[in-house]
Amino acid sequence: AGIPEKAFNLTWISTDFKTILEWQPKPTNYTYTVQISDRSRNWKNKCFSTTDTECDLTDEIVKDVTWAYEAKVLSVPRRNSVHGDGDQLVIHGEEPPFTNAPKFLPYRDTNLGQPVIQQFEQDGRKLNVVVKDSLTLVRKNGTFLTLRQVFGKDLGYIITYRKGSSTGKKTNITNTNEFSIDVEEGVSYCFFVQAMIFSRKTNQNSPGSSTVCTEQWKSFLGE
């Protein structure tokens, strides 16, 4: 077998802490093993001898989302005798070719998922819009934390709305999951929401939610 090709285009794909490392190319006559370093700076083997070009590292990174993880993808010949002891991977006494991934700091680098408008509550001329507080894969004392619990008031929502028939839009920013507006009776309103992390310098905003209108909501509830 020829010398295995080193992986390239190593990319972290992470949304709400669900985290996958992807790379290229598809292997021929060799396999990949991913190694990730923990807080103790030990290397741990993941996706051992895989022919995939991705590896789900969520269970490792959620152990401490404030740590900057290092990972590498090793290219291992299929026919060589390989042993891994959890610390290192050796082929005839030599480390196989590998490529380092960029550092990944989950709390800083995970993308925000698409928010969901959970409900509308009308109280006279006030309309309250509630954005669902989605669960993450981050745990504290054995319990999964919500996005709000993880990011606190650093998590905000940009809410864009318009009267159903109008093209004019208004935008508001809130650091809670609820937002109230004054409405006219009998008029439909449409809402679009984006999540954001105020303190972030990069990947600050989520994709936008689906646009939801109060009329659709009423018909959905069977009113």
Partner: antibody
Framework: QVQLVQSGAEVKKPGSSVKVSCKAS????????ISWVRQAPGQGLEWMGG????????NHAQKFQGRVTITADESTSTAYMELSSLRSEDTAVYYC???????????WGQGTLVTVSS | EIVLTQSPATLSLSPGERATLSCRAS??????LAWYQQKPGQAPRLLIY???NRATGIPARFSGSGSGTDFTLTISSLEPEDFAVYYC?????????FGQGTKVEIK
């Protein structure tokens, strides 16, 4: 406006410990990183460690491992830095500073002078 | 631990002159680098974040550039209040580290 207010100056004997507090107001506390930075007289800035209160896991510079304890009380929005086995070279101004994880330190406390002298 | 090396240690310039301060990292920090100004008896003040973004209220004469391992802080035309010590700091994951500082003094 975010404010970080630190406890007052301390004079300590070599071998003892000091605990400095940093109370945050005017902004979110739990989800931001609080760092502790010190500056010896006439010297540069030295990052000691940091914590994100929601997670409670502190990280420290290697130099201070085993000697520094960084904690946070979410209920009072207060962070603490305790330094043990004090020596004369620990005489410095100790600052707390706030920043998002992997971000700059955008708000700073006023500093706490700790003098270690026999 | 990432080591940040600032140069020069001291920069002697006159008001109105251009100041160029350098910060080099021992390994790549992408763009996770900030610059601070500190005057005697005061806490540091954030000037530049994420390598090139000016913090709130910082005058346009301050600019930052660079990525990876080499970074520059430029003060286009020194004002009397700009004479101070400047520090770079990396935040590409804990432990954060600071450079040793560059003192900008009046010539």
């Amino acid at each position: 406006q975010v404010q970080l207010v630190q406890s007052g100056a301390e004079v300590k004997k070599p071998g003892s410990s000091v605990k400095v507090s940093c109370k945050a107001s005017g902004g979110t506390f739990s989800s931001y990183a609080i760092s502790w930075v010190r500056q010896a007289p006439g010297q540069g800035l030295e990052w000691m460690g940091g914590i994100i209160p929601i997670f409670g896991t502190a990280n420290h510079a290697q130099k201070f491992q085993g000697r520094v304890t960084i904690t946070a009380d979410e209920s009072t929005s207060t962070a603490y830095m305790e330094l043990s086995s004090l020596r004369s070279e620990d005489t410095a101004v100790y600052y707390c500073a706030r920043g998002g994880i992997g971000a700059d330190l955008d708000y700073w406390g006023q500093g706490t002078l700790v003098t270690v002298s026999s | 631990e990432i080591v940040l090396t600032q140069s020069p240690a001291t920069l002697s310039l006159s008001p109105g002159e251009r100041a160029t301060l350098s910060c080099r990292a021992s390994q790549s920090v992408a763009k996770w680098l900030a610059w601070y100004q500190q005057k005697p008896g005061q806490a540091p003040r954030l000037l530049i974040y994420y390598a090139s973004n000016r913090a709130t209220g910082i005058p346009a004469r301050f600019s930052g550039s660079g990525s990876g391992t080499d970074f520059t802080l430029t003060i286009s035309s020194l004002e009397p209040e700009d004479f101070a010590v400047y520090y770079c700091q990396q935040s590409d994951g804990w432990p954060y580290t600071f450079g040793q500082g560059t003192k900008v003094e009046i010539k």
